[in-house]
């Protein structure tokens, strides 16, 4: 670091004074130099380091009419916003000729009521549930002692008595407010006031109670609430990604969601307007007079199949001697699951109902006993699924085949024997 | 005799701009922080910012950040206030005004001792 | 920022009257506080620098004290020029701020 020579006298005729304040104080160091001749650039030094970005000024005033005559020169270095970094010891420099000279010092410090480095924030959290709080402060002067306060109450008997920079809550059962006074030989700084709203816990044990193709009846267990009674809960059911699923974790479904409410108690809902057999993700959240839990995972579950809801459409049946054709169209209506095939019964005049099941396919041909003398046979047709048959199609008669109306050649279905089983559609 | 005349004053639409002078004389720019204050009448006065003219530095208030900048020309011994993006708001007579520096090796804050005569600036459509 | 607030903001006196102003800061500012006195239509005079200096070639029968966060202007014995708005400012932090203004008008 440059240090002053003492060859010769010092030019140095105002030296910098002190300052001491608290952080955000404004301030300006000054020093007076004579010199003779061309008057020099002034420097500034904090503990002995040149600072190469100084706010300063610099002033000259000539004392007489010559170059050569004595200046005044004044320099001027600015404080804008005091910090702990800023203080230290200040001098002024100057080269003069081959000499270095430095003023006498002055001294920057930092005094003042104690400054938070960190204040409690304001947060939710669930009623009953444990959480920490965090309050740090600084001097000088230290040292500083922490004092917190739950709704304007102190928590110790006095600063420093306990705890310090974190606050360990166990749990609130209403919102409260938190703040931490800083105590030092100045004074007293008081923090910002944290509200901590409590909210419901999550609820917990979401499950299905019963199913149904287009409703699902679920349950859950409430959290507890603190002195807040629950005053709804919200379900969201939404239609799983094929093959993506929603993780467990996933804050938000893909698409937007089926949001229905329930009055507690009870803590049941019944959901409907679903699709049958269709795999759904549903969670519930629970909201109080101070705000709605956190959601519950996502519970993956699905509707069941149902029968469909219509019958097999546009039936046709012709007769040609002792054969039938009969074919049809899948039900327009909503099939409410998998479609595993058709059943169709005949049945004619004075004869038993036929019954078969046909499977996949959409037309039959349909071997029939004796000369084919029955008379007003008659055809009905259902489709099912895995929940069942739908419903049976209205019965259409038997048509006579005329030449030259088309004829599809159909594998042969002989008739069983016996019926597997009667239906009293007639 | 210490002396700091404003001038470059005058309506402007807002949105526009404005470049104000603060031309000083019997002392030099470069010993002293010039700041920039104006006044409204119902606003009382208001500081705008300030400059190092020797060193270039700048300070300001928030009101104006982005929108104003302080320059000084120490071989002209003026300092400029140019103002873009002016609103309604803005409307004021603007001062330039000299710190004191009188007051031993320290001193905590500052005062105005010089202030310019004022120049109005009116922002209106 | 620190808020300064000048009471009152206007007063009538007389010739002669003592006259007091008052301005509170909303955070301790030591002495960082200036006076100044502003006529219609001119700039703004300093009187007081530092809450108790009184700036060279302004007249005695101002005064200036207070420290912390109350400050008092005082005019011994109002004279005709001293009629205008006097305002109060800080300086310990930065942005400095302005008192609002006291209007002290001829009663």
């Known amino acids: 670091a440059p240090r002053g020579t003492q060859a010769e006298e010092s030019p140095f005729v105002g030296n910098p004074g002190n300052i001491t304040g608290a952080r955000g104080l404004t301030g300006t160091l000054r020093c007076q130099l004579q010199v003779q001749g061309e008057p020099p650039e002034v420097h500034w030094l904090r503990d002995g380091q040149i600072l190469e970005l100084a706010d300063s000024t610099q002033t000259q005033v000539p004392l007489g009419e010559d170059e050569q005559d004595d200046w005044i020169v004044v320099s001027q270095l600015r404080i804008t916003s005091l910090q702990l970094s800023d203080t230290g010891q200040y001098q002024c420099l100057v080269f003069l000729g081959h000499q270095t000279f430095v003023s006498q010092p002055g001294y920057v410090g930092l005094e003042g009521l104690p400054y938070f480095l960190e204040e409690p924030e304001d947060r939710t959290v669930a009623a009953n549930t444990p959480f920490n709080l965090s309050c740090q402060a600084q001097g000088p002067p230290e040292p500083v002692d922490l004092l917190w306060l739950q709704d304007a109450v102190p928590l110790a008997t006095a600063p420093g008595h306990g705890p310090q920079r974190s606050l360990h809550v166990p749990g609130l059962n209403k919102t409260s407010s938190f703040s931490c006074e800083a105590h030092n030989a100045k004074g007293v700084t008081t923090s910002r006031t944290a509200t901590i709203t409590v909210l419901p816990q999550q609820p917990r044990n979401l499950h299905l109670v019963s199913r149904q193709p287009t409703e699902l009846e679920v349950a859950w267990t409430p959290g507890l609430s603190g002195i807040y009674p629950l005053t709804h809960c919200t379900l969201q059911a939404v239609l799983s990604d094929d093959g993506m699923g929603i993780q467990a974790g996933e804050p938000d479904p893909p698409e937007e969601p089926l949001t229905s409410q329930a009055s507690v108690p009870p803590h049941q809902l019944r959901l409907g307007s679903l699709h049958p057999h269709t795999p759904y993700h549903i969670r519930v959240a629970c909201t109080s007079s101070q705000g709605p839990s956190s959601w519950t995972h996502w519970l993956p579950v699905e509707t069941p199949e149902g029968v469909p809801l219509g019958p097999p459409e546009n039936i046709s049946a012709t007769r040609n001697g002792s054969q039938a054709f009969v074919h049809w169209q899948e039900p327009r209506a909503p099939l409410q699951g998998t479609l595993l095939g058709y059943r169709l019964a005949y049945q004619g005049q004075d004869t038993p109902e036929v019954l078969m099941d046909i499977g996949l396919r959409q037309e039959v041909t349909l071997e029939l006993q004796g000369d084919g003398s029955v008379s007003n046979l008659t055809v009905c047709v259902a489709a099912y699924t895995a929940a069942g048959d739908g419903p049976w199609s209205l019965p259409v008669p038997l048509e006579a085949w005329r030449p030259g109306q088309a004829q599809p050649v159909h594998q042969l279905v002989k008739e069983p024997s016996t019926p597997a089983f009667s239906w009293p559609w007639w | 005799e210490v002396q700091l005349v404003e001038s470059g004053g005058g309506l402007v639409q807002p949105g526009g701009s404005l470049r104000l002078s603060c031309a000083a004389s019997?002392?030099?720019?470069?010993g002293s922080w010039i700041h920039w204050v104006r006044y409204a009448p119902g606003k009382g006065l208001e500081w705008?910012?300030?400059?190092?003219?020797?060193?270039?530095?700048?300070y300001y208030a928030d009101s104006v950040k982005g929108r104003f900048t302080i320059s000084a020309d120490t071989s002209k011994n003026t300092a400029y206030l140019q103002m873009n993006s002016l609103r309604a708001e803005d409307t004021a007579v603007y001062y330039c005004?000299?710190?004191?520096?009188?007051?031993?090796?320290?001193?905590?804050?500052?005062?105005?001792?010089?202030w310019g005569q004022g120049t109005l600036v009116t922002v209106s459509s | 920022d620190i808020q300064m607030t000048q009471s009152p903001s206007s007063l009538s006196a007389s010739v002669g009257d003592r006259v007091t102003i008052t301005c509170r800061a909303s955070?301790?500012?030591?002495?960082?506080v200036a006076w100044y006195q502003r006529k219609p239509g001119k700039a703004p005079k300093l009187l007081i620098y530092?809450?108790?200096f009184l700036y060279s070639g302004v007249p005695s029968r101002f005064s200036g004290s207070g420290s912390g966060t109350d400050f008092t202007l005082t005019i011994s014995s109002l004279q005709p020029e001293d009629f205008a708005t006097y305002y109060c400012?800080?300086?310990?932090?930065?942005?400095?701020?302005f008192g609002q203004g006291t209007k002290v008008e001829i009663k």
């Open positions: 005004a000299r710190e004191y520096s009188g007051w031993g090796g320290s001193s905590v804050g500052y005062a105005m001792d010089y």
């Open positions: 019997g002392f030099s720019l470069s």
């Open positions: 705008v910012g300030w400059i190092n003219p020797y060193r270039g530095y700048a």
């Open positions: 955070q301790d500012v030591s002495t960082a």
């Open positions: 530092s809450a108790s």
């Open positions: 400012q800080q300086s310990y932090t930065t942005p400095p701020t």
